[in-house]
Structure formats: structure tokens, C-alpha cells
Interface confidence: low
Amino acid sequence: NQDLPVIKCVLINHKNNDSSVGKSSSYPMVSESPEDLGCALRPQSAGTVYEAATVEVDVSASITLQVLVDTPGNISCLWVFKHSSLNCQPHFDVQNRGVVSMVILKMTETQAGEYLLFIQSEATNYTIVFTVSIRNTLLFTLRRPYFRKMENQDALVCISESVPEPIVEWVLCDSQGESCKEESPAVVKKEEKVLHELFGTDIRCCARNELGRECTRLFTIDLNQTPQTTLPQLFLKVGEPLWIRCKAVHVNHGFGLTWELENKALEEGSYFEMSTYSTNRTMIRILFAFVSSVARNDTGYYTCSSSKHPSQSALVTIVEKGFINATNSSEDYEIDQYEEFCFSVRFKAYPQIRCTWTFSRKAFPCEQKALDDGYSVSKFCNHKHQPGEYIFHAENGDAQFTKMFTLNIRRKPQVLAEASASQASCSSDGYPLPSWTWKKCSDKSPNCTEDIPEGVWNRKANRKVFGQWVSSSTLNMSEAMKGFLVKCCAYNSLGTSCETILLNSPGPFPFIQDS
């Protein structure tokens, strides 16, 4: 049809730099060259409908959808997204083509969907359909590894159903506690799926691919170790495999191990035993309890008993869905400028969380440490005494958790002053928030001690800069004050700071720092 306009649909991918957040479409961002989206007429549709290629976008990416229309005369347009109409302002480029743009900043799930652009020209009306989806990260997965018994062998297979296929490694350690940290010389790594040496103190399996690294520890009760003050607890989701290892060492082979669930012996086929002699001729026995796919009724106290050691138990809890338990109430802290201080979040979670600490839109790495009582803790000490709002965010695939912290640094006020033709303003970020006084300097009061009682407007905490409160005070100028020096002072329990301003002088205002 010769009436149909020549249309080009393009995608512009913006390289995000933080300053672009929330800015209007005219704000400059670093861009890739435009990508042709090959707008084609949609067959058998009522009216003239063009369809662009689907655009798949990374979470937090910023893009522009753009239509270039080669049609004579003016055009008017309307964007529609999820039944809401959005403003549309066409303009013309140097080739006199109509240009219509839709900017999507910091792509989120809520911005995914169909964007309809209705264009009306002098010749015809038509619709352009853009489909924007979040990048399908389901194609990339990294799942926590789990264990299976190798058929007809006393060995464990480590499995991680991940894409791309992960590299699987066993991480073994024969020491206790801190010395089993990843880079410790006591740690041995074996890049293989099957493990035959199952007598070690600490056994973990890790899987890694482009998405990162996930590990699972073989849950162990050691009858030769003093039991923890709180009962060890193991969480699993319905359908996951259960593996618990009971380990005991004795001077000779004359002892046996048994597993019980709530005082009932485990069924045949739910356990297997291995034994070996150690270098000092003592006997090591291990007894595995396993369930290939747990159900709710597998919940309970699993007790490992020995004829020569005190028995020990662990509580296995089967949940339908993962969880993160922690108090999410926000916490405010007030510290001195050189005081050592760390934020801390104590939580219980299953599966293990991934977490970040955020301040001023910058994310910081998050470390977590397991405590003896089944809880974990994450601390953040790298605040560099910057006041403001700090956010702890955790997720584990099933649950999300966010906690806010506010850090206030006790310090005397520092005053910044500015003036316009009609008013003078002072602001300060000291803490506790300062109070203000204004003084007039004159022949009668060369030390600027004369109070200005009227025209002062104080705004406490008027703007929050990443959680940092700022207090300001404004003096509205009367004709009588013009040409005078005035002094604004901010004071709190830690001290006072002043700034002197010349009202209504020609040219830029000189600020005289008053010590």
C-alpha cells in the first residue's frame, strides 16, 4: 500500500552509569549504536499494525525504544503500557523524519510487557507493538549441590543441576573450625563428582559456573566432640534429599552405631555404614542416614547412638518453602567520629542467603558467619564514618528480607551559606541537628551580637541525602538590611559554627569564614 509510511524501529542500549538514575529522556547516557528491530507489518490484524522484534533486557539495564517515521506532514502519537497512556512527544531529525522515543531506565519486572505506540499522521493511522522482556536468566541456573549414594559402592556423588554445566569439586578438611576456611592449607580440593573418602572431619561439595559458586556441607554429628549447647538443626525443603553422617572413633572395633528417628530405628535401606582404621590403629566408624526425597513426616529428632559413646541428636525440620527469619525493624545508631562500630544482622535462613549491604546506591560485599545456635550473622564495618542510611538485603530464591539502618555521626555543625537578592540561607549537616541564630553586624554591633528577631525561617531536616539529615535556616531580607553584614550560627551540644554574609552586594557574594 503506497499510503503506508516507511517505518524504522530501533533499540538504543544505554551503558548505565549511576547518575542516570531517574533522569528524563534528555539526560545524556553513554549509548551503543542503535539496533534495528525490524518492524514488520503484522498479518491478519485489524488496522495497520507493525511489530518489532522482542527486546530482551538485563535487569537494571537502560534502553530507549525509538520509531523513525518517514511520512509527510505532522504526526501525533500516544504510548500505551498496561492500559495506561503515557506522554508522547514526537520531534523531527535532520532528515526530517518523525522521531518518537520511549526511555526505560533501570529495567525491572514491572516494566516488562507490551508497549503500544499509536501514531496518527495526515495520511493514515497505525500501531506499533514493542515487546520488552526481562532477560531469561532461567537459561542460566546455578543450583545448590546435593548428594546421592553411588550404586553398589560406598561413595557419594555430588550433583548440581545447573546451566551451563558446572564444575563440581569436593572441599575436604580434617581440622576443626576456623582452620577449615577456604584458603587454609588444611583444605584439600578434589575436582570430581564422586567421593570415596568419607571419613574426613569437614566435607563440602561445591558447584561453580558463570553465575558463581554454591556449596553444600555434609551434615555431621561427631560423637567424640562435646555436643553444642543448642541442638544442631538441619532444614530441608519437601522433596530434597536428606543426608546425615554420624562419626565415632574408638580404641578398637568393638562398638556399633545406630540411627533412630523419634526413638524408632530407621528402616532398612535408609542407612549405610563404613569403617576404617586410622594411622594410630583406632577404629573410625561412620553411619549415614539418608532419605532420597524428604516429606513432612521425615521431620523430627534424629539420634545417633553408640555402644561406647554418649548419643547425640539433631533436629531435622522439613519446610514447604524456604525462609529468612530476622527482625526487620529499622535501627538507628549514633556514634562519635572515631568510634569503632559495625552494623550487624542476626538471622536464621534456609536455603543459605545471598546478601548485600548498600549505602548511597553503592553495593558492598556481604559476608555471613554461622553461629553455634543455628543462627547466622552478617556484619558491616566499612561505613568509613559516613552518616546516612544503610540497607541490608538478603534473598535465597524463596524469601527476601530487607533491613534499614541509620548512622548518625556526632559532630559539631559546619555551615554553608548562600544569598540571593531577597534572602540569605545557611545549612548544616552537624549532628545532633543544630539550632540557629542570626546576628546583625553594624557600627553599634561590630562583633555581630545584635539579634535579628524577625524574618527567620528554620527548616530542620529538610532534605535527606541518602539518609543524612540537613538542617537549614533562611533569613528573608528587608530593605533596611541591604548592604549589612549578617552572621548565621549553627550550634549543637558539640559546638558552634558561624558564617558571615554580605547582603545584596553587587557581584558574587563574598563569604567570610568566621572561626
Epitope: S33, P34, E35, R135
Partner: nanobody, 125 residues
Framework: EVQLLESGGGLVQPGGSLTLSCAAS????????MGWFRQAPGKEREFVAA????????YYADSVKGRFTISRDNSKNTLYLQMNSLRAEDTAVYYC??????????????????WGQGTLVTVSS
């Protein structure tokens, strides 16, 4: 289903050049973002370069910027990697990769749906 077959690897001296090709079977080659990854001995697989479905956008790892050029010929169902100023640290198995099936993937590390078998590039004097 897309099958990818790399070729062009071999032994080359430091400072030399090499062009890798990746032939794709299947009629949907032009609808995929394509990329090259590499894996050096004892190291993890790493992103090298990627190209959008139409070829108008290219992405590179910092370590190869200015030395490697990725391109594609949709009419021949072929992806290329022109490697200049090769260094010993470029020694690796190079894998061709096809991204998600949508026609535009806005990312510097495409979601990989299909992998080739790899071709070995050795840079040594």
C-alpha cells in the same frame, strides 16, 4: 536446535594473527546473539566477545579490546573472531556460543543456550 562447529585454531607466534570461524546449522542463526568464550588450562571459562543478532552491536572483554574483532555473516550462518597482536595469555580453548532465542539481547555476557565443542589456540614462540 542449533549445532555450532568452530574451526581456525592452531599454533601461532606472539604478535601474530588468527581468524576463528563458527559454522552454525539451522535456519535460525540470524535470530541469536552470538559470542566467543575461552577457557585456559586450569582456569574458568571467560567471556571474550559478543555480537547482537543483526551485527550492529558488539561487546568485548577488556583484555581483548582493540585486538580482537567479532563479526557475523547471517547469509552464511557463520560467526568470526579476528584475533590480532596475540599474546601468550590468549592461549585457550575458544568456544562459540549462541544466546537466547529473542532477536535482541541487551547484555555484555549473553545468556548461552548452545555451545560449540571448542577449538584450541596456542600462542607460543
Amino acid at each position: 536446535e542449533v549445532q555450532l562447529l568452530e574451526s581456525g585454531g592452531g599454533l601461532v607466534q606472539p604478535g601474530g594473527s588468527l581468524t576463528l570461524s563458527c559454522a552454525a546449522s539451522g535456519r535460525t542463526f540470524s535470530s541469536y546473539a552470538m559470542g566467543w568464550f575461552r577457557q585456559a588450562p586450569g582456569k574458568e571459562r571467560e567471556f571474550v566477545a559478543a555480537i547482537s543478532w543483526s551485527g550492529s552491536n558488539t561487546y568485548y572483554a577488556d583484555s581483548v579490546k582493540g585486538r580482537f574483532t567479532i563479526s557475523r555473516d547471517n547469509s552464511k550462518n557463520t560467526l568470526y573472531l579476528q584475533m590480532n597482536s596475540l599474546r601468550a595469555e590468549d592461549t585457550a580453548v575458544y568456544y562459540c556460543a549462541a544466546g537466547g532465542s529473542t532477536r535482541v539481547v541487551v547484555t555484555t555476557t549473553p545468556v548461552v543456550k548452545y555451545w560449540g565443542q571448542g577449538t584450541l589456540v596456542t600462542v607460543s614462540s
